[in-house]
Amino acid sequence: IWELKKDVYVVELDWYPDAPGEMVVLTCDTPEEDGITWTLDQSSEVLGSGKTLTIQVKEFGDAGQYTCHKGGEVLSHSLLLLHKKEDGIWSTDILKDQKEPKNKTFLRCEAKNYSGRFTCWWLTTISTDLTFSVKSSRGSSDPQGVTCGAATLSAERVRGDNKEYEYSVECQEDSACPAAEESLPIEVMVDAVHKLKYENYTSSFFIRDIIKPDPPKNLQLKPLKNSRQVEVSWEYPDTWSTPHSYFSLTFCVQVQGKSKREKKDRVFTDKTSATVICRKNASISVRAQDRYYSSSWSEWASVPCS
Amino acid sequence: VPGGSSPAWTQCQQLSQKLCTLAWSAHPLVGHMDLREEGDEETTNDVPHIQCGDGCDPQGLRDNSQFCLQRIHQGLIFYEKLLGSDIFTGEPSLLPDSPVGQLHASLLGLSQLLQPEGHHWETQQIPSLSPSQPWQRLLLRFKILRSLQAFVAVAARVFAHGAATLSP
């Protein structure tokens, strides 16, 4: 058993049929010594008396809010949550496996630049009685500070018969050094509580590996005289790290016909312009990627040819 | 470059960008066996990283690029020695189209651009490698190349910025 926060405790249980469970001793936070009784949740049934209560925690029915009273007055509470371990593996019932970039990916994170700011998100089908708390650091043995905000519900989607909820959190490294080569990964830890079930999820990454620039901005076409060619130009996204002579991007320019089956013409360039042939009813799209480190491409920025 | 003269920024920029491309193309082509995480050994002790105080940020380069260039040079020599070690020259043999040989030569080429024959910076950091067992090598190669990708990305940014803003 360990303390998650004040008056909230997590009991770690090996979860299998007829498991013996864990013996837990609760102590009433009071100077009083006698006349103390214990109840669980809203029940008025007295579970025991005395300053301490010893219980055998085996299942969710044994978890909940234990309260000690004296003469009708509440003295203190202890909330017990369960953390299940099945076949040596901690349960992951609360969050959905996003399976990207690999199986058992529950948390996904992205950064728009090298400033040390990043966003993580996760999915669940649970809509109520759900709380999240997020902590982060750079490195684990001698951790350096990363400050995370509160997790918020950022999207709701209908997937087949059930709803899926996306939660996200923003974090910022306290003393970020955008130009340095990271040697210690960022660690993100999410505590999830659904009713009386506790689970924790972790992710470890370098900012460089989660970089995904915003799409290029101000995408414009300039027809070239007496030619089917156009000059496409664009700018670095505002959110990208500066100076651009140091934090450089590379770009992919694509000409795509109306039909998905039509052949795509692609050009790669380090410049912020390119000359392409604009076909009727086609569109021109540009996306960006860090020039020197192959992290994710941005989403496409597009304009029609006509 | 040792002694304060300016590097050939544009040449260094081109070669460091080529290094980035090679480091990424070499990464999946490090052996004939499937990579299995057979133990999580440290890649090597103390791989040189370009750290916050090394002056490789735009401001640091403007103030005095020597600190940064020396750090990059140290790292290039370190990785060049790693790529020549039995981690890469021993079994499992590299795939026939592996660009590790080219990568190795380019690391040497860039380090020589930074430190021509006869000029010397103080003692280099040398990899302290105990002989690797063949079964460890695929994982070691994978980790070394991952870490090299990060190192050459920073080096390439430095030379790109230098070529754009510090070239005579």
Epitope: - | R36, G84, D86, Q133
Partner: antibody, heavy 115, light 107 residues
Framework: EVQLQQSGPELVKPGASVKMSCKAS????????MHWVKQKAGQGLEWIGY????????QYNEKFKGKATLTSDKFSSTAYMELSSLTSEDSAVYYC????????WGQGTLVTVSA | DIVMTQSPATLSVTPGDRVSLSCRAS??????LHWYQQKSHESPRLLIK???QSISGIPSRFSGSGSGSDFTLSINSVEPEDVGVYYC?????????FGSGTKLEIK
């Protein structure tokens, strides 16, 4: 085409030393380790060790430490093995091979130790 | 050291037969096992690497299988030129060790 050309047969007296060579061609000599393998007449194969010509790093079979010394010369793309304090037990064919998971072996050097 | 044990020591076969040669390692070597053929007065020739990977120029009748500590070299239709001694080799860890060989004879 990768080729490993080994030096000719040696007839040596007990207690003496012998140094044999393995000249490599058709590839970058420093890009691969060179192994040495012993085979006594009518018997099996025994791994002696290897040298990495890039940095002259060696890895020996404990059994051959003090018996075999592996060296290389980058300029002539040649690997060498010296055997010391020879006895009749050292009479064998010695092969050089570029990485044991590749199909490149020298033709072997026969060493005969006889008074 | 890892001990490689080969069986049988000798195998007499008729051309066209399918044969299996066995090699056992004294501890798990994953798939780090190579097979060689050595004909009389010749250098060894690599037949199979990493337990099952074929080598260019080696006839397709040679195949390898196994992982961990038990390995098999199969020749699916023996030819008269396949006579010789077949060795397996631990390529997992130092010192590299060879099996004592299986001698293949034609009846």
């Amino acid at each position: 085409e990768v080729q490993l050309q080994q030096s000719g047969p040696e007839l040596v007296k007990p207690g003496a030393s012998v140094k044999m060579s393995c000249k490599a061609s058709g590839y970058t000599f420093t890009s691969s380790v060179m192994h040495w393998v012993k085979q006594k007449a009518g018997q099996g194969l025994e791994w002696i060790g290897y040298i990495n010509p890039y940095n002259d790093g060696t890895q020996y079979n404990e059994k051959f430490k003090g018996k075999a010394t592996l060296t290389s010369d980058k300029f002539s793309s040649t690997a060498y093995m010296e055997l010391s304090s020879l006895t009749s037990e050292d009479s064998a064919v010695y092969y050089c091979t570029r990485r044991l998971d590749e199909a490149y072996w020298g033709q072997g050097t026969l060493v005969t130790v006889s008074a | 050291d890892i001990v490689m044990t080969q069986s049988p020591a000798t195998l007499s076969v008729t051309p066209g037969d399918r044969v299996s040669l066995s090699c056992r390692a004294s501890q798990s070597i994953s798939e780090y096992l190579h097979w060689y053929q050595q004909k009389s007065h010749e250098s060894p020739r690599l037949l199979i690497k990493y337990a099952s990977q074929s080598i260019s120029g080696i006839p397709s009748r040679f195949s390898g299988s196994g992982s961990g500590s038990d390995f098999t070299l199969s020749i699916n239709s023996v030819e008269p030129e396949d006579v010789g001694v077949y060795y397996c080799q631990n390529g997992h860890s130092f010192p590299f060790t060879f099996g004592s060989g299986t001698k293949l004879e034609i009846k």
